[in-house]
Interface confidence: medium
């Protein structure tokens, strides 16, 4: 039992850290391996995470962690029975992957614009709530060349799109992801897509009948 790619870990900086690694052969992760983790702080308890398979040889472990602070460091030990496969440390504040933004919806707005809205995935009291910026990807479902990327660097989780910048009568999908610049985080996963039909004739003719949005 050997590790091919050592664990790579990220924290959502509120409740969960996720580690992923690759074994040198197909492995039943939950039956053969355990990841033990412990906060490097006197009196902290040792915990054990049971990994799951992401692929035949790829294991992933989701570890509940307390609301993190910048100085927290965790000691990680990957075991196959009594064999120590890998040992390392992990500092959540240096490896932040924000939670995925939620509830992306599309609404018709005044002046022939679409209003895209989503929810900040962090409660107001969390450090990351006010640190997030977003990237919104808008793409034409029938034309792979027709896509736009918008960076939302202001606080509010909203984006206004002029309907005239999109092709009339076409179906568009939007998705959003987040990152935390001050934590030098990676991007979050993309939110589920929301799809709508783009018209820029007078809104009132089309609202009930044509406008719809749903999650894939």
């Amino acid at each position: 039992v050997k590790v091919l790619h050592e664990p790579s870990c990220f924290s959502d900086y509120i409740s969960t850290s996720v580690c992923q690694w690759k074994m040198d052969h197909p492995t039943n992760c939950s039956a053969e391996l355990r990841l033990s983790y412990q906060l490097d702080f006197m009196g902290s308890e040792n915990h054990t995470c049971v990994p799951e398979n992401r692929e035949d040889s790829v294991c992933v472990c989701s570890m509940p962690i307390d609301d993190a602070v910048e100085a927290d460091v965790y000691q990680l030990d990957l075991w196959a029975g009594q064999q120590l496969l890998w040992s390392g440390s992990f500092q959540p504040s240096k490896h932040v992957k924000p939670r995925t933004p939620g509830n992306l919806t599309v609404h018709p707005n005044i002046s022939h614009t679409w209003l895209l809205m989503w929810t900040n995935p962090y409660p107001t009291e969390n450090h990351l709530h006010s640190e997030l910026t977003y990237m919104v990807n808008v793409s034409n479902d029938n034309d792979p060349e027709d896509f736009k990327v918008y960076n939302v660097t202001y606080m509010g989780p909203t984006l206004r799109l002029a309907a005239s910048t999109l092709k009339s009568g076409a179906s568009y999908s939007a998705r959003v992801r987040a990152w935390a610049q001050t934590y030098n985080s990676t991007w979050s996963d993309w939110s589920p897509s929301t799809t709508w039909l783009n018209y820029y004739e007078p809104w009132e003719q089309h609202l009930p009948h044509h406008h719809h949005h749903h999650h894939h």
Epitope: S36, T48, D77, W79, G81, Q83, L84
Partner: antibody, heavy 116, light 107 residues
Framework: QVPLQQSGPELVKPGASVKISCKAS????????MNWVKQRPGKGLEWIGR????????KYNGKFKGKATLTADKSSSTAYMQLSSLTSEDSAVYFC?????????WGQGTLVTVSA | DIVMTQSQKFMSTSVGDRVSITCKAS??????VAWYQQKPGQSPKSLIY???NRHTGVPDRFTGSGSGTDFTLTISNVQSEDLADYFC?????????FGSGTKLEIK
Amino acid sequence: QVPLQQSGPELVKPGASVKISCKASGYAFSSSWMNWVKQRPGKGLEWIGRIYPGDGDTKYNGKFKGKATLTADKSSSTAYMQLSSLTSEDSAVYFCARDDYDEASWGQGTLVTVSA
Amino acid sequence: DIVMTQSQKFMSTSVGDRVSITCKASQNVRSAVAWYQQKPGQSPKSLIYLASNRHTGVPDRFTGSGSGTDFTLTISNVQSEDLADYFCLQHWNYPFTFGSGTKLEIK
């Protein structure tokens, strides 16, 4: 079904060798370490070493190097321990043990008696 | 080699009591400690792995705790069938080493 079935008791003469076996069942023999443990009458436990049947990798307690040789036969899912140059100090019960988290199991033990 | 010291050779307790068996490592062994129960004339049985995790089928009155150098096996609500020797094992460094054992006697 007993996960680890060890061979029966052995009475051997000083200076001789003995080979005891541990037959595994009910799990992937090749992908779990097999440990061997010594227990003298009324005494504690001593770790002899372990073998990884998948590739034959062995780890020994320095105290037992040259005394114990660990091997494994994947085709029969059997681990073996040979003890050589036996003396009265080697009289003991020897256990094989697989200890992988919730899959922990120990053999019933093999009593080796060294006597002229 | 790492020495695992079980300073209590014998412990006497009564049914229903709570008893704590300790094990001290001569150096930091992280959480790499297992606990075993051996009843007279039987093979050892694995109780606890990685310091604090109960094996499947082990009653929840057995609890492991500790990390680094100090480890404890606690038996709450002791039962007569808990009469046995208890051993700790470190598997952080080769060679793995056992504690000398603690014999639990029931009054």
